[in-house]
């Protein structure tokens, strides 16, 4: 499924994740929009053989598991083909892990290079949540 | 079959303590966040503590706050209620039960599979 | 006191349709029902408002919207006589609804 930007704004707000850790609803938007396009069903091979799954593109080595990444942690504790649903459950919960863990949503190279110190409210703006 | 099963409820005098355990198979309990609800004779459904996947985000309802403590213990497939500080109106039958979404961190959508209960009965 | 608001008792008559309301600002996320008959635990019949878990009847509906979650039955049934509970996402609960099939 590809999202629309107000559609995203308000499942992952009804799912939580607005000012989750402190971010601000625009952030996530912001971060799904660099890293999957509003795709849920993205996913990008890595060169160290791990792959991103998903709307946050959530990484396979230390996030889920998908069965062929070496040493993987599945640290969220799900099959990564959980993180392709239409459904964005997996993807929130996963990414509240993964906020939580001390690098906050630096952990997204997408979130750090395209949304960090920017206007990310205007992801929101006009939505009606 | 997914099965919950609680024991250790009994009669207990105010202010003393009581541990319960609930016993999960059929599933991967490491996975799922685990709840205990309660049943006042009578009454309606009082939630009363959520232990995620994650062993650190346990929450609390406030009646319970600072007296009771939820733990599990995933190699066991064990959930367990600490009830310390018992008072006349923690009287109940009390459930356990799983949450419907596999991994859910923080954040409770229902909950899919329940036990029979336990009864809990605090009189001097 | 609840945070989540129901009506005590809704009735019906056979093979029409129940609706019980549940309100409250935690309902700006998800909310679910349960249904409990006396003697038995409760049974989840929609969670993430509107989804339904294997083996519930597809009678068995739920909505959102503006803070407010409803459950739908169609073709209420004598076995749909019960108490309704809605639940939030915090974990709590409403005060229940009984339902009663004339």
């Known amino acids: 499924k590809v999202f629309g930007r107000c559609e995203l704004a308000a499942a992952m707000k009804r799912h939580g994740l607005d000012n989750y850790r402190g971010y601000s609803l625009g952030n996530w938007v912001c971060a799904a929009k660099f890293e999957s396009n509003f795709n849920t069903q993205a996913t990008n091979r890595n060169t160290d053989g791990s792959t991103d799954y998903g709307i946050l593109q959530i990484n396979s080595r230390w996030w889920c598991n998908d069965g062929r990444t070496p040493g993987s942690r599945n640290l969220c504790n799900i099959p990564c083909s959980a993180l392709l649903s239409s459904d964005i459950t997996a993807s929130v919960n996963c990414a509240k892990k993964i906020v939580s863990d001390g690098n906050g949503m630096n952990a997204w190279v997408a979130w750090r290079n395209r949304c960090k110190g920017t206007d990310v409210q205007a992801w929101i703006r006009g939505c009606r949540l | 079959e997914f099965q919950l099963v609680e024991t250790g409820g009994g009669v207990v005098q105010p202010g003393r303590s009581l541990r319960l355990s609930c016993a999960a198979s059929?599933?991967?309990?490491?996975?799922?966040?685990m709840h205990w609800v309660r049943q006042a004779p009578g009454k309606g459904l009082e939630w009363v503590a959520v232990i995620y996947y994650d062993e650190n985000n346990k929450y609390y309802a406030d009646s319970v706050k600072g007296r009771f403590t939820i733990s599990r213990d995933n190699s066991k497939n064990t959930l367990s209620l600490q009830m310390n500080s018992l008072r006349a109106d923690d009287t109940a039958v009390y459930y356990c039960?799983?949450?419907?979404?596999?991994?859910?961190?923080?954040?409770?959508?229902?909950?899919?599979?329940w036990g029979q209960g336990t009864t809990v009965t605090v009189s001097a | 006191s609840y945070d989540l608001t129901q009506p005590p008792s809704v009735s019906v008559s056979p093979g029409q349709t129940a609706n019980i309301t549940c309100s409250g600002n935690?309902?700006?996320?998800?909310g679910c029902w349960y249904q409990q008959k006396p003697g038995q635990s409760p049974l989840l019949v929609i969670y993430q408002d509107n989804k339904r878990p294997s083996g519930i009847p597809e009678r068995f509906s739920g909505s959102n919207s503006e803070n407010t979650a409803t459950l739908t039955i169609s073709g209420t049934q004598a076995l749909d006589e019960a108490d309704y509970y809605c639940q939030a996402w915090d974990g709590s609960f409403g005060g229940g609804t009984k339902l009663t099939v004339l």
């Open positions: 935690k309902l700006e996320k998800f």
């Open positions: 039960a799983r949450d419907v979404v596999v991994a859910a961190f923080d954040f409770s959508y229902g909950m899919d599979v």
């Open positions: 059929g599933f991967i309990f490491s996975s799922y966040g």
